[in-house]
Amino acid sequence: TIQGTNRSSKGRSLIGKVDGTSHVTGKGVTVETVFSVDEFSASVLTGKLTTVFLPIVYTIVFVVGLPSNGMALWVFLFRTKKKHPAVIYMANLALADLLSVIWFPLKIAYHIHGNNWIYGEALCNVLIGFFYGNMYCSILFMTCLSVQRYWVIVNPMGHSRKKANIAIGISLAIWLLILLVTIPLYVVKQTIFIPALNITTCHDVLPEQLLVGDMFNYFLSLAIGVFLFPAFLTASAYVLMIRMLRSSAMDENSEKKRKRAIKLIVTVLAMYLICFTPSNLLLVVHYFLIKSQGQSHVYALYIVALCLSTLNSCIDPFVYYFVSHDFRDHAKNALLCRSVRTVKQMQVSLTSKKHSRKSSSYSSSSTTVKTSY
């Protein structure tokens, strides 16, 4: 969001004021409340960064994120027998990603058409609400998953219905919290017509009174409460997990688990470094600069950081891969273009052939789909 200027009386991601209606006269539009942007912001809004780079990234996120998270949700809901807490958190993570990614075609079209939003006020608000909602949901569910992974290593007890119910309760609480904290994004007017550029922006230019104080306070609160605190919990969980894994006995099975745990840690760390840290940091810096100077010199960086934050929808499937045995099976087979059922039939027929040749016992892979802890 950048700062726009209202040119009537008073008044991002440019400062502006809630604009009035407009009516067409001749070849142009006569606006009743006008927003003006500075030259740097105008160059960003019309430049290759927002009209070429962003659509490319969002297209990649959509093409990768939609099927992978769709498959993950399907696996966790219908192909996983035991609904462990980890499965519940990952299912919610996949759902959050899907709810954000399904709106990406509109976002892609918006940027390709020179940051011109033609889909109306309500859709813009939904897109923005889901965009930020996804980021903060991902952070919180990732934190829950990380803490839960550590808890399993410390307390390797069997699956209990109580644990699953607690995980469902925590998930519902997270959804409710995110819904509450994103209310301002749904309430505030996000679309603004920029006469100089002849475009209607969605979230890229926001009203001045709102930006100056409220938006800085809003994103600072979110950065502390929904980013820094969960990040600290996640880091602590993984540090303790590494310590536990180091001191544990080393057999072939635990070595596999340890390697997978390390891969998971690296994936989550990458997600924080690429997606969550730059966006949360730049959200605060960007709005601080607008609050103090009336314009943001980090606007281009802020745009890139927010864009990269959507990559979490592509990185999350790797988390599912390292955590869920079921997702691993389905992902491998999906990539090899064959169904899990076909693989299992192959395994069963292979087993029976071996049985007929040798009279020794041979156990096939379990048909019960497991989730590795």
């Epitope: 209202n6 006269t25 142009g28 500075d38 006469p195 100089a196």
Partner: antibody
Framework: QVQLVQSGAEVKKPGSSVKVSCKAS????????VIWVRQAPGQGLEWMGV???????YYAQKFQGRVTITADESTSTAYMELSSLRSEDTAVYYC?????????????WGQGTLVTVSS | EIVLTQSPATLSLSPGERATLSCKAS??????LDWYQQKPGQAPRLLIY???SRATGIPARFSGSGSGRDFTLTISSLEPEDFAVYYC????????FGGGTKVEIK
């Protein structure tokens, strides 16, 4: 070099309209906006409205409904029409060039057009 | 609407003296303030834009400072041609001119 040349002085009757022209040279009207400012005798400057290079316009609340700003790219001329004239509209009307962005000033001005409204 | 208040209304000084003109905004306008000079029968002329940037061809004796709500135009040593009316203009939220300060020969 950049120049804005305005039309000559006008004497109008109350209730009538006046159309002041502003011919631009040394720059393209499609790349720059033109703003209009007026100054009543012995008074300060008062901002009236703007037309952007793409034809979009915005008028100060005080003049909304009475003022119309247009531009003709083929002749590089901007126009300001003020209707329902009253005696208090007697003023010198200036046009000025504006880049169209928040951080740009009104860098070049026309010489001004005196409009006298008298019965 | 943002109101700009210029002071003093009239400044009586002799050539060679330093002139300090003030412009106060009713709310924060950041750096978005310009200064214009107007001589009798002439159009306004841009001196300073965005608080402290000198326009093309403007002598170094003209300088601008301030931010937020308080702004100052300083003429370090008045030349005979500097006696005129000076207007400030804010362009952060709407375009509004100040009432003007007349710099006259004492």
């Amino acid at each position: 070099q950049v120049q804005l040349v305005q039309s000559g002085a006008e004497v109008k009757k109350p209730g009538s309209s006046v159309k002041v022209s502003c011919k631009a040279s040394g720059f393209s009207l499609s790349s720059y906006g033109v703003i209009w400012v007026r100054q009543a005798p012995g008074q300060g400057l008062e901002w009236m409205g703007v037309i952007w290079g793409n034809g979009n316009t915005y008028y100060a609340q005080k003049f909304q409904g009475r003022v119309t700003i247009t531009a003709d790219e083929s002749t590089s001329t901007a126009y300001m029409e003020l209707s329902s004239l009253r005696s208090e509209d007697t003023a010198v009307y200036y046009c000025a060039r504006w880049r169209g962005y928040k951080d740009y000033p009104f860098d070049y001005w026309g010489q001004g057009t005196l409009v006298t409204v008298s019965s | 609407e943002i109101v700009l208040t210029q002071s003093p209304a009239t400044l009586s000084l002799s050539p060679g003296e330093r002139a300090t003109l003030s412009c106060k905004a009713s709310q924060n306008i950041y750096k978005y303030l310009d200064w214009y000079q107007q001589k009798p029968g002439q159009a306004p002329r841009l001196l300073i834009y965005n608080t402290n940037s000198r326009a093309t061809g403007i002598p170094a004796r003209f300088s601008g400072s301030g931010s937020g709500r308080d702004f100052t135009l300083t003429i370090s040593s008045l030349e005979p041609e500097d006696f005129a009316v000076y207007y400030c203009l804010q362009h952060n939220s709407g375009w509004t001119f100040g009432g003007g300060t007349k710099v006259e020969i004492k």
